[in-house]
């Protein structure tokens, strides 16, 4: 069965046959235990791993340092992978990242880099990334220059304030930052003049929270 | 429509501190961005450094860390910025604009009239 | 930090074309902001996001953008028009301005 095959993540599955989107199991390095993850096998030529998915406000991303680590929420629905099993994948080669938007008004755009990983938990999962491109803004809405992973109970920016508090969810903050996608989900007509929404500076503005969002990994030599 | 009303003229000796305030009215003023951008005479505009109030965290160009301190009272939608060690070089016209949002890397959609600072012994 | 390249004077007659360029290595990847200003007046925002322009501003105002240089483009360039212009960019937490380039209307 496709479950017991070695799959180090979505590029091995869709390598060996599988193309349809859907969950699958993976087996990472330096993990005891496998993970089911959605793979999207649509996008830009497949092979993609989701580590994050937004679509609905059914679940809660306002959670702590732990609940982060380790992930939370359905990888059939919204989810975080996990910064554990994101640093994991990310250590065993090179990979790219995949950021897909879409606003209240079915407009989709998307950012890509180039370069894609984090460090490990005494690093504050620190995020480093390269070579920006995309539809979501010429600029990056990613601090390039690498920020570290904050929650509501670590706080690890670099503003006085807390960002992650003031600004919901779990994120990269920089102080605050142009993004967080693991803000507060606003339903249309409610979405604008939000600070603490779902943000991507360079696609809709500081204040707009965004509908979907979906951020995907894959090798660089897929 | 948000304006940005500045303090009047100022007459420093070398050595002193001069601050400016910088008053907004008819909007946000805490999730914005104000910079401070100043403009020596017959000379291009210079960023000095901005604060977003609602994060309260400021940030300085390198050429003026250790000599300016921006800070903001949100009861007062107020913002200021403050030059210490004035040389003449100083002299300039300084002037508070926001930017369009709780970022740095934005356009600065809105500007104060000026503050005229003159630094002579 | 980085720095932002402007001629620094550009002449034109009435109801010609002028093009003011800004050149910078970060400019691929950063937005470019340009800045109309008038002698003894505060800076104005002509054209944002390498090509958008604000409300209120004249269609004659344009602006594009190829790899490391960006150019403001004012077509039918009229007596008002003459001013000092600015080309600025930013990243996250620090912001550039050009050094300025003088528009100067013949006749």
């Known amino acids: 069965r496709e479950e017991e095959k070695p799959f180090r993540d979505c590029a091995d599955v869709y390598q060996a046959g599988f193309n349809k989107s859907g969950i699958y199991t993976i087996y990472i390095n330096n993990m005891p235990e496998p993970k089911k993850v959605f793979c999207n096998m649509d996008v830009n030529g497949g092979g993609w791993t989701v580590i994050q998915h937004r679509e609905d406000g059914s679940l809660d991303f306002q959670r702590g340092w732990k609940e982060y680590k380790m992930g939370f929420g359905n990888p059939s629905g919204e989810y975080w992978l996990g910064n554990e099993f994101i640093f994991a994948i990310t250590s065993q080669r090179q990979y790219m990242l995949r950021i897909e938007l879409m606003d209240w008004e079915g407009n989709r755009a998307y950012s890509q880099y180039d370069r894609f990983h984090i460090g490990n938990e005494k690093q504050n999962y620190r995020l480093y990334l390269k070579g920006h491109t995309g539809t979501a803004g010429k600029q990056s809405s990613l601090i390039l220059h690498g920020a570290d992973f904050s929650t509501k109970d670590a706080d690890n920016d670099n503003c006085m304030c807390k960002c992650a508090l003031m600004l919901t969810g779990g994120w990269w903050f920089d102080a605050c930052g142009p993004s967080n996608l693991n803000g507060m989900f606003y339903t249309a007509g409610q979405n604008h003049g939000k600070l603490n929404g779902i943000k991507w500076h360079y696609f809709k503005g500081p204040s707009y929270s965004l509908r979907s969002t979906t951020m995907m990994i894959r090798p660089l030599d897929f | 429509q948000v304006q940005l009303v500045q303090s009047g003229a100022e007459v420093k000796k070398p050595g002193a501190s001069v601050k400016v305030s910088c008053k907004a009215s008819g909007g946000t003023f805490s999730s914005y961005a104000i910079s401070w951008v100043r403009q020596a005479p017959g000379q291009g505009l210079e960023w000095m450094g901005g604060i977003i109030p609602i994060f309260g965290t400021a940030n300085y160009a390198q050429k003026f860390q250790g000599r300016v301190t921006i800070t903001a009272d949100e009861s007062t939608s107020t913002a200021y910025m403050e030059l210490s060690s004035l040389r003449s070089e100083d002299t300039a016209v300084y002037y508070c604009?926001?930017?369009?949002?709780?970022?740095?890397?934005?356009?600065?959609?809105?500007w104060g009239q000026g503050t005229m600072v003159t630094v002579s012994s | 930090s980085y720095e932002l390249t402007q001629p620094p004077s550009v002449s034109v007659s009435p109801g010609q074309t002028a093009r003011i360029t800004c050149s910078g290595d970060a400019l691929p990847k950063q937005y470019a902001y340009w800045y109309q200003q008038k002698p003894g007046q505060a800076p104005v925002l002509v054209i944002y996001?390498?090509?958008e322009r604000p409300s209120g501003i004249p269609e004659r105002f344009s602006g594009s953008s190829s790899g490391t240089t960006v150019t403001l483009t004012i077509s039918g360039v009229q007596a008002e028009d003459e001013a000092d212009y600015y080309c600025q960019s930013a990243d996250s937490s620090h912001v550039v301005f050009g050094g300025g380039t003088k528009l100067t209307v013949l006749g």
């Open positions: 604009a926001r930017f369009e949002s709780g970022y740095w890397g934005d356009a600065f959609d809105i």
């Open positions: 996001k390498d090509s």
